[in-house]
């Protein structure tokens, strides 16, 4: 089992431990080997104390166990004897956060250590590019987030304030939407939403690229490029390429490099080079028609990042097509 | 032998600080938890604390908590119980006691008097 | 906390009798209580711990049961040299707590 967990040392038996919403961790414990061993785990709260695990006599006691914590704790049997006292504890919520305090006796020793245990919650944010009549907006969307996220903006690298946050769920995990009015705006533009808790950061980037202007029958060549500075190599990530019609987005292509496989939804699509570098993604759109007119959107995505290329495509209609009518 | 050694009596001023002593000999002093109890004729024996010295961890009773503070020096084999602010309330005999949960060996006990 | 409760203050009993001394804990402690002596001028000493278990050297006229909330700490034929001040303590959980104790006089 992996368990996801940072370990903070604090002095005088305490330690801070941080986990993830939903997935499962370890409160650790120890003392020295001895013998007819006791061993509560509490819950500490303002008010009161809550069994959380109990042993003695030779086996896990769960009679006095508070009701939130059935089926989700246990621990390691086998290893008590080696000075082991450690919580297993399963489906990490908000609400188990707060001080736990594992008390363990022996024939010749009795200690108490205090594990203080954090629960952060982050998935993985998104930046959306939307149209709305004349205007366009930028969004960096967190679905859910425990604590409140630290979310800055920036314009060509230069911090900006200027973005209308929205936000629900009132204790948390919250669901965050930063958006930005970029409407006429040929600049560049970075999201950046940090966890300080599971000291995790998300950066989505936006780039509108010089407007293409191509005949008819025509092929158009729209760059996008993996930037070496936001990803690491071992790093999952997608690609998808996308036209935006009417504030509508529909899929060209999506690539995923887990599996190396591409989907193409549109046969005049190709990529420009092989992919053998996976870095550079740009596209050829072939045999061009006046209704490929608009704008086209590569979105290269990972845990970390969202690099968004906006292409504006004008296609003109050729000499003869102009002649013949 | 298992013995715990402790200063018969200690006379202190109210407001004044004392430390008190316990050494251990006849056993591996790091390997054991030492508590102390206090013993007043109106509450009997009351555990105020204990230390365990192979890594100093220490638990307290709530109500002593700020009263009293437990430390260990493993090289001379002594536990040392301090009790800050002193009131009359806290003239009283006081043992400290080797073991786990229970005490098997007992000083002979340190009797405090908070006298002006 | 789990609050130690000897009901009887005094015990008053004769040399060759058999007397029980009663504690109860104001939560099941399943039989982690253990018993002391004291005798006057002298430091408390462990008669019994795990609610039945003889401490090395005492006497097997000490004999302690129970368990959960009750329990018991008998001595089988008294003699004048266990007059003394006995208490409980349940080594369940900290705090630990002793009882009040139980002054045991010889007629």
């Known amino acids: 089992i992996f368990l996801s967990a940072f370990f903070t040392y604090v002095p005088m038996n305490e330690q801070i431990i941080i986990g993830r919403l939903g997935e499962d961790i370890i409160l650790p414990s120890s003392f020295e080997r001895g013998s007819e061993v006791v061993i509560h785990w509490k819950y500490q709260d303002s008010y009161n104390s809550y069994n959380v695990h109990s042993y003695y006599k030779g086996s896990g006691r769960l009679e006095s166990q508070d009701t939130r914590y059935a089926n989700r704790t246990s621990l390691f049997y086998n290893e008590i004897q080696n000075g082991n006292a450690s919580l297993f504890f399963r489906r990490l919520s908000l609400l188990d956060e707060g001080i736990y305090t594992c008390y363990v006796g022996t024939a010749i020793q009795a200690i108490t250590n205090k594990v203080v245990l954090k629960v952060g919650v982050f998935l993985t944010p998104m930046m959306k590019y939307e149209k709305r009549n004349t205007n366009s907006f930028l969004i960096c969307n967190v679905l859910s987030v425990y604590p409140r996220p630290i979310i800055t903006w920036k314009m060509d690298n230069t911090p900006i304030s200027e973005n209308n946050m929205q936000e629900t769920g009132s204790l948390g995990p919250f669901s965050i939407n930063s958006t930005l009015n970029i409407t006429g705006s040929n600049s560049s533009y970075e999201c950046t939403i940090e966890n300080s808790l599971l000291k995790q950061t998300w950066t989505g980037r936006w780039t509108m690229k010089d407007g293409l202007h191509k005949m008819q029958s025509e092929h158009v060549s729209l760059s996008c490029e993996l930037v070496n500075d936001y990803f690491s190599p071992n790093q999952d990530f997608k690609v998808t390429w996308s036209r935006m019609e009417s504030g509508i987005s529909s899929i060209l292509a999506y690539y995923l490099s887990s599996s190396q496989n591409t989907t193409f939804y549109e046969s005049r699509f190709s990529w420009n080079k092989e992919l053998k570098n996976q870095s550079d993604f740009s596209m050829n759109l072939t045999d061009l028609s006046l209704s490929d007119s608009g704008e086209y959107l590569c979105n290269i995505s990972s845990d970390e990042y969202t690099l968004l290329t906006i292409h504006t495509v004008h296609v003109e209609p050729s000499q003869e097509t102009a002649s013949d009518n | 032998q298992e013995q715990l050694q402790q200063p018969g009596t200690e006379l202190v001023k109210p407001g004044a600080s004392v430390k008190i002593s316990c050494k251990a000999s006849g056993y591996t002093f790091s390997s054991y938890s030492m508590h102390w109890v206090k013993l007043t004729p109106g509450q009997g024996l009351e555990w105020m604390g204990t230390?365990?010295?192979?890594?100093?961890?220490?638990s307290y009773n709530q109500k002593f908590k700020g009263k009293a503070t437990l430390t260990a020096d493993k090289s001379s084999s002594t536990a040392y119980m301090q009790l800050s602010s002193l009131t009359s309330e806290d003239s009283a005999v006081y043992y400290c006691?080797?073991?786990?949960?229970?005490?098997?060996?007992w000083g002979q006990g340190t009797t405090l008097t908070v006298s002006s | 906390d789990i609050v130690m409760t000897q009901s009887h203050k005094f015990l008053s009993t004769s040399v060759g009798d058999r007397v029980s001394i009663t504690c109860k804990a104001s939560?099941?402690?399943?039989?982690?209580v253990a018993w002391y002596q004291q005798k006057p001028g002298q430091s408390p000493k462990l008669l019994i711990y795990?609610?039945?278990t003889r401490h090395t050297g005492v006497s097997d006229r000490f004999t302690g049961s129970g368990s959960g909330t009750d329990f018991t700490l008998t001595i089988s034929s008294v003699q004048a040299e266990d007059l003394a001040l006995y208490y409980c303590q349940q080594h369940f959980d900290i705090p630990y707590w002793f009882g009040g104790g139980t002054k045991l006089e010889i007629k």
């Open positions: 006691a080797r073991g786990g949960y229970y005490f098997d060996y």
């Open positions: 230390i365990y010295p192979g890594n100093e961890n220490t």
């Open positions: 795990w609610a039945s």
């Open positions: 939560q099941d402690v399943s039989t982690a």
